[in-house]
């Protein structure tokens, strides 16, 4: 799902507004590209990425990709346009304020990806199943 922002083009740039018509600034995201990670078997992890970047385009969201194979674990943090696939996958959760990891099928490795649309939201990546809910009351309890 693409975030529920109205988009219009000016000089080939997307001007993104929220539901109230206020201009939405480009996202601030953690942006360390691919780094080795020690995040493993945890409900959530911090990215340990010291680079906070403004995204190039207002429509971009924050993305985190966690990968584990026989040799290492990596965490990738970037900005990306949710209208475009990333690692061949659609960013289904781009409107989420939290980066809730979902497993994707990739041969030869364990591959999780999340996307989110609040500032630096890819700094805290969440694996725990209890966060993967569509129940807003439960979300309220969890995030308080």
């Amino acid at each position: 799902t693409i975030p529920p922002h109205v988009q219009k083009s000016v000089n080939n740039d997307m001007i993104v507004t929220d539901n109230n018509g206020a201009v939405k600034f480009p996202q601030l995201c953690k942006f360390c590209d691919v780094r080795f990670s020690t995040c493993d078997n945890q409900k959530s992890c911090m990215s340990n990425c010291s680079i906070t970047s403004i995204c190039e385009k207002p429509q971009e969201v924050c993305v985190a990709v966690w990968r584990k194979n026989d040799e290492n674990i990596t965490l990738e943090t970037v900005c990306h346009d949710p209208k475009l696939p990333y690692h061949d996958f659609i960013l289904e959760d781009a409107a989420s304020p939290k980066c809730i990891m979902k497993e994707k099928k990739k041969p030869g490795e364990t591959f999780f990806m999340c996307s989110c649309s609040s500032d630096e939201c890819n700094d805290n990546i969440i694996f725990s199943e209890e966060y993967n809910t569509s129940n807003p009351d439960l979300l309220l309890v969890i995030f308080q």
């Epitope: 740039d13 001007i15 942006f31 970047s53 995204c55 190039e56």
Partner: nanobody, 111 residues
């Protein structure tokens, strides 16, 4: 080594004007989106203005009509012209450009 350096801040009376500069080295600003952020005392950082490579600039509602961003590509500098300043504009102002480049900030006090 990429560096962004803000300057031009200071103490100004309400209704006054300031022009902030963001000078870059190690990066060509004409090929980058550049944004101005500010952090009022004891508050969260907030977006002020965002200037895209193609020249489209968006402004926060709180500064629209009072603040203007301009670029001088020859000087590799981006400016934030601030008019009709209000006490609530008091903050440390930062410029930033992808990927992850931030200046040290310049203090603006309206009092």
């Amino acid at each position: 080594q990429v560096q962004l350096q803000e300057s031009g801040g200071g103490l100004v009376q309400p209704g006054g004007s300031l022009r902030l500069s963001c000078a870059a080295s190690g990066i060509i600003l004409s090929s980058k989106a550049v944004a101005w952020y500010r952090q009022p005392p004891g508050q969260q950082r907030e977006g002020v203005a965002h200037s895209s490579v193609s020249g489209t600039t968006i402004y926060a509602d709180s500064v629209k009509g009072r603040f203007t961003v301009s670029r001088d590509n020859a000087k590799n500098t981006v400016y934030l012209e601030m008019n009709s300043l209000k006490p609530e504009d008091t903050a440390v102002y930062y410029c930033t450009a992808p990927v992850g480049h931030w200046g040290q900030g310049t203090q603006v006090t309206v009092s």
